[in-house]
């Protein structure tokens, strides 16, 4: 800031320092600094320093403060959705038998039509309409990797419910990968959670779009509410505008 | 606000409305409202309305905006830590054999000494020092429920690493439960993630405090770095102060 | 929290979220947004007194820090805390578009 | 983002995070906080121009909304965006205490 602003800057600094004095005392609920009359001489005990250091250290898996949104997130995102490939498609044939899993495949050409470039994607959600559920169920979501290998993505504990409910899984990273790769069909697997010592691995939850024996209108409604990817992305023309204005202010 | 302030309020409203005009156009990267000359007559297509409604609905599992911190979170939190009960304690005897899990038990009297009331606890983290790891490992954390039943809490994908690293799991809810109950010893289990179709369930990761055959100083250092609960809580005397000043401003 | 539950039902003179419904047609003269017809934008208004100086080290003032200047700013300001997005439907040529606009609805305010 | 990486290395005149190290002993005259000896508190400073009126509907101004008034406030204000906590060690009587103070360190600012 210019030199003429130095006095203002110093004044603001002084007011900020003054305010911090009040802030710290206030946060500690102290009317004035605590008496130091009982403090023993010498350094802090080792255990106290260890505790202080534990508190100070950011560690793996600890939720830090949320990151401020990047500049691109200020701009509007176009919303599209891509429905799951219908279950009578041949891709499902080799996966039909399982009692612990259901499979959801998506046509990547449809995804590319909605989002031409991976970098444009700002959020992708897998949405599933969960029908009523009698017992609590712990489910896991996997991404199809190579031929028959699956990569764990996330999990959810589903509470019993008498009414249908939409579930949402954040799959932004996965869809961004799919848009970068050449594959035609990509997919997810929803499985019962299996612990190492428990062998009860039946998927109890009923997801709309997988139940059989429906006819006519009901099947159509059912099909419309089948799993889908909700995509939020920067439109291509807006993105080009963004790239050209990368300079600061 | 008092009637004398009405004019100010109206002015602010007008400026806010004006600003929103610019904000919406800016977010859409439009210099002016779009031409409506090509818009077909009639209502919006069903599919578009469905998509609009999908976007508008908050659904289970979708990350909403972060909640603003409650008043109590403004105030300082006292930090304490409770080390895991050492592994030579008899409580571990019945759990020693497993290849897919390690067990961590805590003395609830120590927890209660640190946090006398469950409501005072604002955060509890289980911290584990992970030693070097040769392969990627997917681990799960469970809470001891009844005699031999375990409740799933969370999971973590651990990347290979040549250096030790502290891991942190948020276990606030669990510790709050423990503080409310009468139990003397409560515990966690860290297990290899087992998918329903894979049977490779060996826990590869080496957590400090569980390896055997150490002597003297090394064992002490090792013991000090054994798993612990890092607790952040409102001190009792500050909480009473908070309750008495529940009135607004 | 200085949210809609508290602020809309009180006569709070200090920083609070204030009601403001924007009707796209009436307020902005716009007919091009097809859905929604308007939305509760709301706004933040009210003073955030600067309440600390060296001669004010007493409990009454300190207890007010939480509301008036929790961030210990040199010039605290009443600003949005919790915000929500707004989806809209409009046409580009013959094509209807659904777009999500981030941070359009003010749910609560804070002194910052 | 108007964060320490950008602001500390630029001569930005508008809203930005500014460097401020608080030494508890020198700046506050306090000897009672045993750890840390001080901390980088930082602060937000700089104008957030109000850049919209009915006669300014053109691209140049609209592109600036992002920085100057993203929240479409009637009086945009330069305030903290990302904040971090500060743990401290002090004595209560003979007993050392570790306490965590939330939102003490300003990492980035925004016009709001």
């Amino acid at each position: 800031l210019s030199t003429s602003k130095t006095i203002d800057m110093e004044l603001v600094k002084r007011k900020r320092i003054e305010a911090i004095r009040g802030q710290i005392l206030s946060k500690l609920r102290l009317a004035s600094p605590p008496s130091q009359g009982e403090v023993p001489p010498g350094p802090l005990p080792e255990a106290v320093l260890a505790l202080y250091n534990s508190t100070r250290d950011r560690v793996a898996g600890e939720s830090a403060e949320p990151e401020p949104e990047p500049e691109a997130d200020y701009y509007a995102k176009e919303v599209t959705r891509v429905l799951m490939v219908e279950t009578h498609n041949e891709i499902y044939d080799k996966f039909k038998q399982s009692t612990h899993s259901i499979y959801m495949f998506f046509n990547t050409s449809e995804l590319r039509e909605a989002v031409p470039e991976p970098v444009l994607l700002s959020r992708a959600e897998l949405r599933l309409l969960r029908l009523k559920l009698k017992v609590e169920q712990h489910v896991e979501l996997y991404q199809k990797y190579s031929n028959n290998s699956w990569r764990y993505l996330s999990n959810r504990l589903l509470a019993p419910s008498d009414s249908p409910e939409w579930l949402s899984f954040d799959v932004t990273g996965v869809v961004r990968q799919w848009l970068s790769r050449g594959g035609e069909i990509e997919g997810f697997r929803l499985s019962a959670h299996c612990s190492c010592d428990s062998r009860d691995n039946t998927l109890q939850v009923d997801i709309n779009g997988f139940t059989t024996g429906r006819r006519g209108d009901l099947a159509t409604i059912h099909g419309m509410n089948r799993p889908f990817l909700l995509l939020m992305a920067t439109p291509l023309e807006r993105a080009q505008h963004l790239q050209s204005s990368r300079h600061r202010r | 606000l008092s009637t004398s302030k009405t004019i100010d309020m109206e002015l602010v409203k007008r400026k806010r409305i004006e600003a929103i005009r610019g904000q919406i156009l800016s977010k859409l990267r439009l210099a002016s409202p779009p031409s409506q000359g090509e818009v077909p007559p009639g209502p919006l297509p069903e599919a578009v309305l469905a998509l609009y409604n999908s976007t508008r609905d908050r659904v289970a599992g979708e990350s909403a905006e972060p909640e603003p911190e409650p008043e109590a979170d403004y105030y300082a939190k006292e930090v304490t830590r409770v080390l895991m009960v050492e592994t030579h304690n008899e409580i571990y005897d019945k759990f020693k054999q497993s290849t897919h899990s390690i067990y961590m038990f805590f003395n609830t009297s120590e927890l209660r000494e640190a946090v006398p009331e469950p409501v005072l606890l604002s955060r509890a983290e289980l911290r584990l020092l992970r030693l070097k790891l040769k392969v990627e490992q997917h681990v799960e954390l469970y809470q001891k429920y009844s005699n031999n039943s375990w409740r799933y809490l969370s999971n973590r994908l651990l990347a290979p690493s040549d250096s030790p690293e502290w891991l942190s799991f948020d276990v606030t809810g669990v510790v709050r439960q423990w503080l409310s109950r009468g139990g003397e010893i409560e515990g966690f289990r860290l297990s290899a993630h087992c998918s329903c179709d894979s049977r490779d369930n060996t826990l590869q990761v080496d957590i400090n405090g569980f390896t055997t055959g150490r002597r003297g100083d090394l064992a002490t250092i090792h013991g000090m770095n054994r798993p612990f609960l890092l607790l952040m809580a409102t001190p009792l005397e500050r909480a009473q102060h908070l309750q008495s000043s529940r009135h607004r401003r | 929290a200085l949210d809609t539950n508290y602020c809309f039902s009180s006569t709070e003179k200090n920083c609070c979220v204030r009601q403001l419904y924007i009707d796209f047609r009436k307020d902005l003269g716009w007919k091009w947004i097809h859905e929604p017809k308007g939305y509760h934008a709301n706004f933040c208004l009210g003073p955030c007194p600067y309440i600390w100086s060296l001669d004010t080290q007493y409990s009454k003032v300190l207890a007010l820090y939480n509301q008036h200047n929790p961030g210990a700013s040199a010039a605290p300001c009443c600003v949005p805390q919790a915000l929500e997005p707004l989806p809209i439907v409009y046409y580009v040529g013959r094509k209807p578009k659904v777009e999500q606009l981030s941070n359009m609805i003010v749910r609560s305010c804070k002194c910052s | 983002a108007l964060d320490t990486n950008y602001c500390f290395s630029s001569t930005e005149k508008n809203c930005c995070v500014r460097q401020l190290y608080i030494d508890f002993r020198k700046d506050l005259g306090w000897k009672w906080i045993h750890e840390p000896k001080g901390y980088h508190a930082n602060f937000c400073l700089g104008p957030c121009p109000y850049i919209w009126s009915l006669d300014t509907q053109y691209s140049k101004v609209l592109a600036l909304y992002n920085q100057h008034n993203p929240g479409a406030s009637a009086a945009p204000c330069c305030v903290p965006q990302a904040l971090e906590p500060l743990p401290i060690v002090y004595y209560v009587g003979r007993k050392p205490k570790v306490e965590q103070l939330s939102n003490m360190i300003v990492r980035s600012c925004k016009c709001s």
Partner: antibody, heavy 119, light 107 residues
């Protein structure tokens, strides 16, 4: 204004006793630990004893342990040093000082009182 | 007990000179070191606390540095009123101990 005023010094025979006082003013006495430091003629400073604000904790140099006791009366804003079994090497100017903080620096000192142990 | 060794025990300097006094501890004392100034017939006066912090009211020509076992008191430009004896003191552990002192005399 912080003031510390020592009294009670004088001539005493070896083996005798003496009680030094330090009257404090200008600050909240009970909030501060207090200390005694002595200086033999022509020599350097030697720390003698200290006491916490409440009087609950006391500290002594090895050279006076078991012979000297430190105490305080917070209602009278006064610090004491009871010296028994005095020796010739205890001859010195005795200063009382205020312990400023948990770092144990002595920020205010009295003018001192002379204790002479001689037969 | 922790021993503090001051050097030099005395020095002669002129007004305007830069003067450096060192204090060495027999074991590490972190930054638990204070510096005092004493003039003949007067009580000591605190100059520097916690190795490097200037006590309120003390001229800025005085500065302290160091950590662990080696510490320094520096007077950047000696003034007439600075001719005195200077003591270091450790507060790392009881018994608290002082250095032997450094007498700064007029050359």
């Amino acid at each position: 204004e912080v003031q510390l005023l020592e009294s009670g010094g004088g001539l005493v025979q070896p083996g005798g006793s003496l009680r030094l006082s330090c009257a404090a003013s200008g600050f909240t006495f009970a909030d501060y630990a207090m200390t005694w430091v002595r200086q033999a003629p022509g020599k350097g400073l030697e720390w003698v004893s200290a006491i916490s604000g409440s009087g609950a904790a006391t500290y002594f140099a090895d050279s006076v342990k078991g012979r000297f006791t430190i105490s305080r009366d917070n209602s009278k804003n006064t610090l004491y040093l009871q010296m028994n079994s005095l020796r010739a090497e205890d001859t010195a100017v005795y200063y009382c000082a205020r312990v400023s903080s948990g770092h144990w620096d002595f920020d205010y000192w009295g003018q001192g009182t002379l204790v002479t142990v001689s037969s | 007990d922790i021993q503090l060794t001051q050097s030099p025990s005395s020095l002669s300097a002129s007004v305007g000179d830069r003067v450096t006094i060192t204090c060495r501890a027999s074991q590490s004392i972190s930054s638990y070191l204070n510096w005092y100034q004493q003039k003949p017939g007067k009580a000591p006066k605190l100059l520097i606390y916690a190795a490097s912090n200037l006590q309120s009211g003390v001229p800025s020509r005085f500065s302290g540095s160091g950590s662990g076992t080696d510490f320094t008191l520096t007077i950047s430009s000696l003034q007439p009123e600075d001719f005195a004896t200077y003591y270091c003191q450790q507060t790392y552990t009881v018994p608290l101990t002082f250095g032997g002192g450094t007498k700064v005399e007029i050359k």
